[in-house]
């Protein structure tokens, strides 16, 4: 059974994941982002279902494509390079979903833009956090 300390750790990890996803979205939605139109042409796979931590497998599988799109932004002017962000997100995702069980991700038929993709996973984090508090 989960202890209060493990629940607290999970909550903190989800909050960190949420914050980095939100910051990425802030950067993409920046009204002066000249690459936004190009970024929106890339398609991302969305999970058919995302209600449990194991479903983070679906996010993990899309992290490499996400990094590639983020690299379009402002190559010479990164405060945080996409590889720094994706590396941190990957570590959090692996810890949250665990590596013991193998979960085969099921994707929805429709693909999504990077904005829709990020918003979906932001909503996921917020939803799980709300069940822990």
């Amino acid at each position: 059974a989960p202890t209060s300390s493990s629940t607290k750790k999970t909550q903190l990890q989800l909050e960190h994941l949420l914050l980095d996803l939100q910051m990425i979205l802030n950067g993409i939605n920046n009204y002066k982002n000249p690459k936004l139109t190009r970024m929106l042409t890339f398609k991302f796979y969305m999970p058919k279902k995302a209600t449990e931590l194991k479903h983070l497998q679906c996010l993990e599988e899309e992290l490499k494509p996400l990094e590639e799109v983020l690299n379009l932004a402002q190559s010479k002017n990164f405060h945080l390079r996409p590889r720094d962000l994706i590396s941190n997100i990957n570590v959090i995702v692996l810890e949250l979903k665990g590596s013991e069980t193998t979960f085969m991700c099921e994707y929805a038929d429709e693909t999504a833009t990077i904005v829709e993709f990020l918003n979906r996973w932001i909503t996921f984090c917020q939803s799980i956090i709300s069940t822990l508090t």
Epitope: L18, L19, L21, M23, N30, K32, Q74, N77, L80, N88
Partner: nanobody
Amino acid sequence: EVQLLESGGGLVQPGGSLRLSCAASGSIFSANAMGWYRQAPGKQRELVAVISSGGSTNYADSVKGRFTISRDNSKNTVYLQMNSLRAEDTAVYYCMYSGSYYYTPNDYWGQGTLVTVSS
């Protein structure tokens, strides 16, 4: 509007340590990047270290293994622990706050704090 209050600069001998702090206040996004850039006399401003509120970090190659960036999200404060300081670390260190992972015109910068490494 975001205000940045820096502290911790000063004179230190080569091999010594300093800790810089920067507290952000005002219209803060909870999701942000904060960190430190520096400018030595006659040189361009360069990245030292940046950390996101989610814990992602980026360090300049020249400070890796010597400097450590950390933050307290509850206080909107970022810290830079600088160890094994060298003469070439002498510069004005500027705190930076951004709502994005890359440079934007909406980024905020502190007034700067002088770090002098000299015997």
